[in-house]
């Protein structure tokens, strides 16, 4: 807390300008009117205040707006935003995407701070859903943003927003998140032709069910091994050797290098060795010839 002291004669601030950087903390407290500061917030960012001085300016705004700052002030906080606590930000009502962008710009190039996370949360909740423009903005500043959301939060993403997602935005997503995003992507890209569709859907395929993989295998997509290795194991297991061969196209040779890793390892164990041999890759571990395969899950369903 800065002590209340009278402003020295002739030092009362008539406007927010560069002369204030030479004011001591107590002088800022005594000589800068909070209402003046609020109306000239757009100037603060251009003035080289120290963070110690910004603390004083924040204190003045807190006194003026105990219930939370209005958006007209928030939009121009600039570096003062870094002085806000998550508790401060929870009092705000941020509705403008321009305000969000302005504040994210301040933190650009740095990890997502608790302040930024709270700001985004407030903004998205205020909008009711993660629309395309918001998602566009957030992933531009934080490519991993989408994968930081829970499956429940992702469920509020409308399919139209999926167009804003780039492959790198999904790098850190786990299968549970892709399970939610894949159906939205499928819906978003449904009117595209085969090859264009595959390019767009590829990074979401970690959430694809078996039937969709079977359908893709009929379209000469030539899936690369990196994508194949990210598929759900339970979706890959029912695929036949012929289907996997068609799905991977020329990349099928890469299975050999991955035969000890999931989902390739588990898939091999489910295939007849005879069928695996047709690939000519030397894949071992399939079901020996002459053995009968009982699908116990089907048997249970019938009984």
């Amino acid at each position: 807390e800065v002590e209340k002291t009278a402003c020295p004669s002739g030092k009362k601030a008539r406007e927010i300008d560069e002369s204030l950087i030479f004011y001591k903390k107590w002088e800022l407290e005594a000589c800068v009117d909070a209402a003046l500061l609020a109306t000239q917030m757009d100037r603060v960012n251009a003035i080289p205040f120290t963070y110690e001085q910004l603390d004083v300016l924040k204190h003045k705004l807190d006194e003026l707006y105990p219930q939370g700052y209005p958006e007209s002030v928030i939009q121009h906080l600039g570096y003062l935003f870094l002085k806000m606590s998550p508790e401060d930000i929870r009092k705000w009502n941020v509705t403008s995407l321009e305000t969000l962008k302005a504040l994210l710009e301040v933190n650009k190039g740095h990890e997502m701070s608790p302040q930024v996370a709270t700001l985004i949360d407030r903004f998205v909740k205020g909008r009711g859903q993660l629309d395309k423009d918001t998602l566009d903005t957030l992933t531009a500043f934080y490519p991993g943003y989408l994968c930081s959301l829970s499956p429940e939060e992702l469920s509020s993403v409308p399919p139209s927003s999926i167009w804003a997602v780039r492959p790198q935005d999904l790098d850190t997503c786990d299968p549970r998140q892709l399970d939610v995003l894949y159906p939205k992507a499928r819906l978003a890209f449904q009117n595209m032709n085969g090859s264009e569709y595959f390019v767009k859907i590829q990074s979401f395929l970690g959430g694809a069910p078996t039937e969709d993989l079977k359908a893709l295998s009929q379209q000469n997509v030539s899936m690369d091994l990196a994508t194949f290795m990210k598929l759900r194991t339970d979706a890959v297991l029912p695929l036949t050797v012929a289907e996997v061969q068609k799905l991977l196209g020329p990349h099928v040779e890469g299975l050999k290098a991955e035969e000890r890793h999931r989902p390739v390892r588990d898939w091999i164990l489910r295939q007849r060795q005879d069928d695996l041999d047709t690939l000519g890759l030397g894949l071992q571990g399939g079901i020996p010839n002459g053995y009968l395969v009982l699908d116990l899950s089907m048997q249970e369903a019938l009984s």
Epitope: F49, Y51, Y79, L82
Partner: nanobody, 115 residues
């Protein structure tokens, strides 16, 4: 983190000149602006001069025309050229870097102006 180390202080006669240096290291890419502050014996800390990343400079009235602040980005060093020194310039001079999201300070260098 940003580390700052000042040098160049010493005993100088009134009317003389000194050049202070401040070598910055660490996360220097996060620095927004840097400055020189001073604290005279028994007095509070006061800002002498500031320079922004784009080279805009600001001076306190009591040093205008006598002191010059500059930066050498290739050496990550901040300078304060002090000319026409007076007895009242005697103080510990501190280098400060305002970087994301705090202020970093050097340990200070003593300048004594005395005949």
């Amino acid at each position: 983190e940003v580390q700052l180390v000042e040098s160049g202080g010493g005993l100088i006669q009134p009317g003389g000149s000194l050049r202070l240096s401040c070598a910055a290291s660490g996360n220097i890419g996060s620095i927004r602006h840097m400055g020189w502050h001073r604290q005279a014996p028994g007095k509070g800390l006061e800002l002498v001069s500031t320079i922004t990343t784009v080279g805009t400079t600001y001076y306190a009235n009591f040093v205008k025309g006598r002191f010059t602040i500059s930066r050498d980005n290739s050496k990550n060093t901040l300078y304060l050229q002090m000319n026409s020194l007076r007895a009242e310039d005697t103080a510990v001079y501190y280098c400060r870097a305002t970087a994301h999201p705090t202020d970093y300070w050097g340990q200070g260098t003593l300048v004594t102006v005395s005949s």
